[in-house]
């Protein structure tokens, strides 16, 4: 039975040109995390495999950085980065858990939400 839950940063905003950390956390389960995929509307951004390390999609390698932890750092943000992001946790023995984050990239400097996950 899948007892775990994914906690995410929820709806966050950041400034154009800035950076943001996407974070998910799996709790309430003893299942072993074997791999975490990060996707943006069906497009793979990155994979963090417990044994193989990180795979960053070549299309994003110049502005996506692995971590911290199982999270993902998006850099040089553009308005086109606005949208849904998904963390997909592959676990043993539970199976797959999915978390959702909505990122809004703002033209102005009004980026109050999720400030603790921003990189200055």
């Amino acid at each position: 039975m899948m007892t775990g839950t994914i906690e995410t940063t929820g709806n966050i905003s950041a400034e154009k040109g800035g950076s943001i950390i996407l974070q998910c956390h799996l709790s309430s389960t003893t299942a072993q995390v074997t791999q975490v995929n990060w996707e943006q509307q069906d497009q793979l951004l990155a994979i963090c495999n417990a044994d193989l390390g990180w795979h960053i999609s070549p299309s994003f390698k110049d502005r996506v950085a692995p971590g911290p932890g199982l999270g993902l750092t998006l850099q040089s943000l553009t308005v086109n980065d606005t949208g849904e992001y998904f963390c997909i946790y592959h676990t043993y023995p539970d199976g797959t858990y999915t978390g959702r984050i909505f990122l809004e990239v703002l033209e102005s400097s009004v980026a109050e939400h999720g400030a603790r996950f921003q990189i200055p």
């Epitope: 074997t34 193989l52 795979h55 999609s57």
Partner: antibody
Framework: EVQLVQSGAEVKKPGASVKVSCKAS????????MHWVRQAPGQRLEWMGR????????KYNEKFKSRVTITVDKLSSTAYMELSSLRSEDTAVYYC????????????WGQGTTVTVSS | DIQMTQSPSSLSASVGDRVTITCRVS??????LAWYQQKPGKSPKLLIY???TLAEGVPSRFSGSGSGTDFTLTISSLQPEDFATYYC?????????FGPGTKVDIK
């Protein structure tokens, strides 16, 4: 056109080391991880390890961990695989292979380098 | 390590035949499976990744299916250039491992 061109065949004595090179062209070298895979005569393919050419970070198959070193030279877009303490069972064709867009599989392969270990 | 088995180990077929190769994996790898074609003296060529996604430039007669532990490669209508050895590979954990191969030859 993506190309991975490997160094030529090698004959080595048991206990020696071999260093195989793989020169990449036709794409941005630092954007794609590189794998090394070998194939002994009549055997299945065997994965040895992978490297991120951008950071130099690598991961190895535990079976080879103490004997294999994978490195890159970003300036020349070349990956290297060095295998030490060679034994006859290391006689194989060694391949470099570029990691694909969407995971840890390999989408382009070098032509292979035959390494023969014989006394 | 994740163990990979393939069946059959070899098969004889004619041009135009439908050919099916099976790959069985020792544990759940979701859809993280690739298929490669290798001809004698040549490098492997990627056919399929993520169990069912056709690699660039690969003819549509090749298809892949399956998830979890059981996977299939199908060639809908065998062509002369398809006579080769086919390998499955999981791309899910360390070490990445390959199946023993299935040799497809001319009947």
């Amino acid at each position: 056109e993506v190309q991975l061109v490997q160094s030529g065949a090698e004959v080595k004595k048991p206990g020696a080391s071999v260093k195989v090179s793989c020169k990449a062209s036709g794409y941005t070298f630092t954007n794609y991880y590189m794998h090394w895979v070998r194939q002994a005569p009549g055997q299945r393919l065997e994965w040895m390890g992978r490297i991120d050419p951008d950071s130099g970070g690598s991961k190895y198959n535990e079976k080879f961990k103490s004997r294999v070193t994978i490195t890159v030279d970003k300036l020349s877009s070349t990956a290297y695989m060095e295998l030490s303490s060679l034994r006859s069972e290391d006689t194989a064709v060694y391949y470099c292979a570029r990691e694909g867009h969407y995971g840890f599989y390999s989408d382009y392969w070098g032509q292979g380098t035959t390494v023969t270990v014989s006394s | 390590d994740i163990q990979m088995t393939q069946s059959p180990s070899s098969l004889s077929a004619s041009v135009g035949d439908r050919v099916t190769i099976t790959c069985r994996v020792s544990e759940n790898i979701y859809s993280y499976l690739a298929w490669y074609q290798q001809k004698p003296g040549k490098s492997p060529k990627l056919l399929i990744y993520n169990a069912k996604t056709l690699a660039e430039g690969v003819p549509s007669r090749f298809s892949g299916s399956g998830s979890g532990t059981d996977f299939t490669l199908t060639i809908s209508s065998l062509q002369p250039e398809d006579f080769a050895t086919y390998y499955c590979q999981h791309h899910y954990g360390n070490p990445l491992t390959f199946g023993p191969g299935t040799k497809v030859d001319i009947k």
